[in-house]
């Protein structure tokens, strides 16, 4: 069962001092939503017992395995059902505490009732404040039964539930008709899924015989021990004030476990701690009684004395629950209550016994759950004991369960049952995950979901080049850390597999499925440098670079040019996909911008060192286009262009540029500067006769502006072939006839 305890502090003079604490003894309990499981939850369950809303309760976590609920402001806040949930996965367990108001009309004689399937359960509600009305019984909040108020027997109302079945489990309440629900007596009925002394799916297995009030769990056959007792069969008492499956927890406060109610996983329910009884667990056991709720009677023999926490304390020469066994009777010594082995191992189990006459090898035997008896292969005889060693055949899952070591001599016999847990070594269900890769190393996350049993003690990563027959390389790592595989070959596929191990001999599981992980290319090592750059327009930049000369092939796939615009905080990246390229034209840049420029060689996804940066200022954008451009042929070799100045100029024009191109021609256009910016007319000379030309123009201030519209005009015919167009400018007001 899960080691989970819900403690209720019942010192009820002041509700504000009331608290509930949930303590988990599970490994890694409550650490949050990490690989080891969800946190402890502690809450009031208002589904069945609804109380008036109040301020929210305060939840405080104390370390990883304890959570406390406080903030109760009035007694009615306490009444009802509280639950703590702990454990991970299939072991997730809910522990329930039912709190009754001490001032209620009806009080339960006993809150928790654990019964076996088919038993008759009797719930008894004691009259605390009489009302002369019917008593209504409810089950899980729904009407169940009515009793007339005259039906009280010795001041108690009894509800008999014959032949109970597991679905009968739940919260029962007894309330006087029309009384407040807070004045009800609340009970918890737990019905085990099997008849007395049985457990398992078909109730075919026999319980180990839980001692000291322990209750056999109907699913796994384990004893859920009362607070203050431990061992497979709850045979061992904890020291006073301690609880938990291994007596590892200590009751808070100076008065130990006084005033505390302990709730444990079903089918145990709740009780006072060992040595205490009463509705508020504040009364010490009467003489001759001990244990949780003082339910056990000592009946010590042979001079034994009764300790209210642990039972009979035997004088020298006697042992046993009632000091009924003489030390002459053989006795099994120091047998572990629980042992764990891995599947298919062949462990050695030791069993030591003492007695008079002295036990010999043949007098000690080991019995498996299926009834098979093993005889010891070796015995070590010492002055005070004989230790028999048993070689166990290869373990199978069916070997899980209660084993028994038995010693028999002419002085009598003794036996000790112990639990053997056969665990399945873990096998990864998935391949490891690649986190990052470089040319010579892979970083891998090895911990994956697995079948079989934890905890994971070691993780082995096996790897070798793909399609290789060479031996696997192995690295052993911590389960919670990522692994770096080093000294690998670049641009190589590796087959990688995980192997998990759990503690103990034979804990290594089978290898998990393989996955292919490929190392990156070698990093490019050459550092380019920028040879030069020139502006080819307000938004265009031509860049050139060089590489150092080195012997051997160039390690690289291309170049990455980076332009950083510091003003806007923007980076522009340009990929040049040829490693032979040494120049690139960058277009679409922002005019008037300061750029920092560098270049670096790349190979696969890896970048080499960047060149020393250069700083480039692009000229600002130019002026708007000239308006109303018009062309007029003057002769067979001259055409006059007229225009109007651009509007909304950002500054004085430095020149105009005219573009001349033969219509339909394939050659490059000719650009002609008009260096007198005040001109609004120019004559283009040296044109070919009877030829159709296209003209457009733009202005320049610090940078070239936008092109005007394109105009078309033909020279007049019958002229000679000209040498090429030239221009002559005049101010428009001079006229064409001068």
């Amino acid at each position: 069962a899960v080691d989970l305890t819900l403690l209720a502090n019942l010192r009820l003079t002041d509700p504000q001092r009331f608290f509930l604490t949930c303590v988990s003894g599970e490994a890694g309990a409550g650490r949050g939503s990490d690989a080891w499981g969800p946190p402890l939850l502690l809450e009031k369950d208002d589904r069945i017992v609804r109380t008036p809303p109040g301020p929210p309760l305060r939840l405080a976590r104390n370390g990883s395995h304890q959570v406390t609920l406080r903030g109760f402001s009035k007694p009615s806040d306490l009444v009802g059902v509280f639950s703590c949930v702990g454990g991970a996965g299939a072991r997730r367990t809910r522990v329930i505490y039912v709190h009754n108001s001490p001032g209620a009309h009806l009080l339960p004689d006993k809150v928790t009732h654990t019964v076996n399937k088919g038993d008759t359960a009797v719930l008894s509600a004691r009259v605390h404040k009489e009302k002369q009305t019917d008593v209504i019984w409810k089950s899980n909040g729904s009407y169940f039964y009515t009793l007339d108020w005259h039906e009280a027997q010795d001041g108690r109302f009894l509800l008999q539930l014959p032949n109970v079945q597991p679905p009968s489990s739940g919260i029962y309440s007894a309330t006087y008709l029309e009384a407040s629900p807070l004045g009800s007596a609340f009970f918890r009925l737990i019905v085990r899924g099997c008849g007395a002394g049985r457990w398992g799916p078909g109730c075919t297995k026999e319980c180990p015989g839980c001692l000291h009030g322990g209750v056999c769990h109907d699913h796994d056959g384990e004893c859920v021990c009362p607070p203050g007792f431990t061992g497979t069969r709850c045979e061992q008492a904890c020291r006073e004030g301690r609880f938990g499956q291994s007596c590892q927890e200590q009751c808070p406060g100076i008065s130990g476990c006084r005033g505390l109610t302990f709730c444990l996983p079903d089918p145990y329910g709740c009780s006072c701690g060992s040595g205490w009884r009463g509705s508020q667990c504040q009364e010490a056991c009467a003489p001759g009684h001990f244990g949780a709720d003082c339910r056990l009677q000592c009946q010590c023999q042979n001079g034994g004395t009764c300790d209210r926490f642990s039972g009979c304390v035997c004088p020298s020469g006697w042992h046993g629950v009632h000091c009924e066994k003489s030390d002459r009777i053989p006795q099994i010594l120091n047998m572990a209550s629980e042992l764990e082995f891995n599947l298919e191992t062949m462990p050695r189990i030791n069993c030591a016994a003492a007695g008079n006459p002295f036990p010999v090898r043949g007098s000690i035997e080991l019995r498996k759950p299926d009834g098979t008896v093993l005889l010891s292969t070796k015995a070590i005889v010492e002055p005070e004991k004989t230790t028999a060693e048993f070689e166990v055949p290869r373990l199978v899952l069916a070997d899980s369960g209660f084993w028994e070591c038995r010693v028999s001599t002419s002085g009598g016999q003794d036996s000790r049952r112990f639990k053997v847990n056969v665990k399945v070594p873990p096998v990864p269900l998935a391949a490891p995950r690649l986190l990052t890769k470089q040319s010579r190393q892979l970083v891998v996350s090895p911990l994956v979901s697995f079948s079989g049993d934890g905890p994971i003690s070691t993780v082995r990563l096996h790897y070798r080049p793909q399609d290789s027959t060479m031996d696997w390389s192995t690295i052993v790592v911590d389960p919670s850390e990522n692994v770096t595989l080093m000294n690998l070959r670049p641009k190589t596929g590796y087959s990688v597999r995980v192997q998990l191990s759990r503690p103990g001999e034979g804990g290594e599981g089978a290898w998990g499925p393989p996955t292919l992980m490929t190392t990156d290319c070698p990093e490019p090592l050459l550092q380019p440098w920028l040879e030069g750059w020139h502006v080819e327009g307000t938004d265009r930049l031509r860049v050139s670079w060089s590489l150092p000369l080195v012997p051997g092939p160039l390690v690289g796939d291309g170049f990455l040019l980076r332009l950083w615009d510091g003003t806007r905080g923007q980076e522009r990246r340009e990929n040049v996909s040829s490693p032979q390229a040494r120049t690139a034209l960058l277009t679409g840049l922002t005019p008037g911008t300061h750029y920092q420029l560098d270049v670096q060689l790349y190979h696969c996804t890896l970048l080499g060192p960047a060149s020393p940066p250069a700083h480039v200022l692009l000229p600002p954008s130019g002026p708007p286009a000239p308006r109303h451009l018009h062309a007029q042929a003057l002769s067979d070799s001259e055409i006059q262009l007229t225009w109007k100045h651009p509007e909304a100029l950002p500054g004085p024009i430095s020149k105009y540029v005219v573009e001349v191109q033969v219509a339909g021609g394939a050659g490059d256009p000719l650009w002609i500067d008009v260096d007198r910016p005040e001109e609004t007319s120019t004559i283009i000379r040296g044109l070919n006769a009877s030829t159709r030309y296209l003209f457009r123009m733009r202005a320049s201030i610090q940078g070239l502006g936008d092109w005007s519209n394109t105009v078309e005009e033909s020279t007049l015919g019958n002229g000679l072939q000209a040498e090429g167009p030239v221009q002559e400018s005049r101010a428009a007001e001079e006229g064409l006839d001068q």
Partner: antibody, heavy 117, light 110 residues
Framework: EVQLLESGGGLVQPGGSLRLSCAAS????????MHWVRQAPGKGLEWVSV????????YYADSVKGRFTISRDNSKNTLYLQMNSLRAEDTAVYYC??????????WGQGTLVTVSS | QYELTQPASVSGSPGQSITISCTGT?????????VSWYQQHPGKAPKLIIY???NRPSGVSNRFSGSKSGNTASLTISGLQAEDEVDYYC??????????FGSGTKVTVL
């Protein structure tokens, strides 16, 4: 569906006897109080008797005390009313009703008892 | 026999609210919050419409509401409708573990 069905009514002479039955279905009969309530022609409702789930506790209206006996058979899910020494004023429609805490829900459709010579 | 006192008849126009009173003693109405109200159509069995003074069973119109002050309980029918023209009875648990009904009220919709 919770259902109650009365039977056994009829014409009976003064001083005579009659046994009414009420068959219950659709609920756990053995867990509830059961009542008989009657209504004389053109008159109001009159509570007659109650029996507790165990059958051990019964109460009667003063007008029928000593003459009527309420009983139940939880194994048969049936409620009974044994009426002896009947009088003309016992003429009424007799209803059985399930008692949930302090009220009646549901009711049967009723059976008519006529006491007349 | 005990009898709780109800008016023999109460009338109201459609859409109006009417209230039916039910007066008992401190051993019944005044002693417990266990007053219930029943509606009865002619020739039919009574039907529970209010329990524990003011609670409505599921399926009962919210035009019906109940209250109690001292030894007198009341049933209010708001937004009176033609189909409300039937008989209404109050009932109460008593200190002797018996039950008692009112004399009944005939509601008329004008």
């Amino acid at each position: 569906e919770v259902q109650l069905l009365e039977s056994g009514g009829g014409l009976v002479q003064p001083g005579g006897s009659l046994r009414l039955s009420c068959a219950a279905s659709g609920f756990t009969f053995s867990a509830y109080k059961m009542h008989w309530v009657r209504q004389a022609p053109g008159k109001g409702l009159e509570w007659v008797s109650v029996i507790y789930p165990s059958g051990g506790w019964t109460y009667y209206a003063d007008s029928v005390k000593g003459r009527f006996t309420i009983s139940r058979d939880n194994s048969k899910n049936t409620l009974y009313l044994q009426m002896n020494s009947l009088r003309a004023e016992d003429t009424a429609v007799y209803y059985c009703a399930r008692g949930t805490a302090g009220w009646f829900d549901p009711w049967g459709q009723g059976t008519l008892v006529t006491v007349s010579s | 026999q005990y009898e709780l006192t109800q008016p023999a008849s109460v009338s109201g126009s459609p859409g109006q609210s009417i209230t039916i009173s039910c007066t008992g003693t401190n051993t019944d109405v005044g002693g417990y919050n266990l007053v219930s109200w029943y509606q009865q159509h002619p020739g039919k069995a009574p039907k529970l419409i209010i329990y524990e003074v003011s609670n409505r069973p599921s399926g009962v119109s919210n035009r019906f509401s109940g209250s109690k002050s001292g030894n007198t309980a009341s049933l209010t029918i708001s937004g009176l409708q033609a189909e409300d023209e039937v008989d209404y009875y109050c009932g109460s648990y008593t200190s002797s573990s018996t039950h008692v009904f009112g004399s009944g009220t005939k509601v008329t919709v004008l």
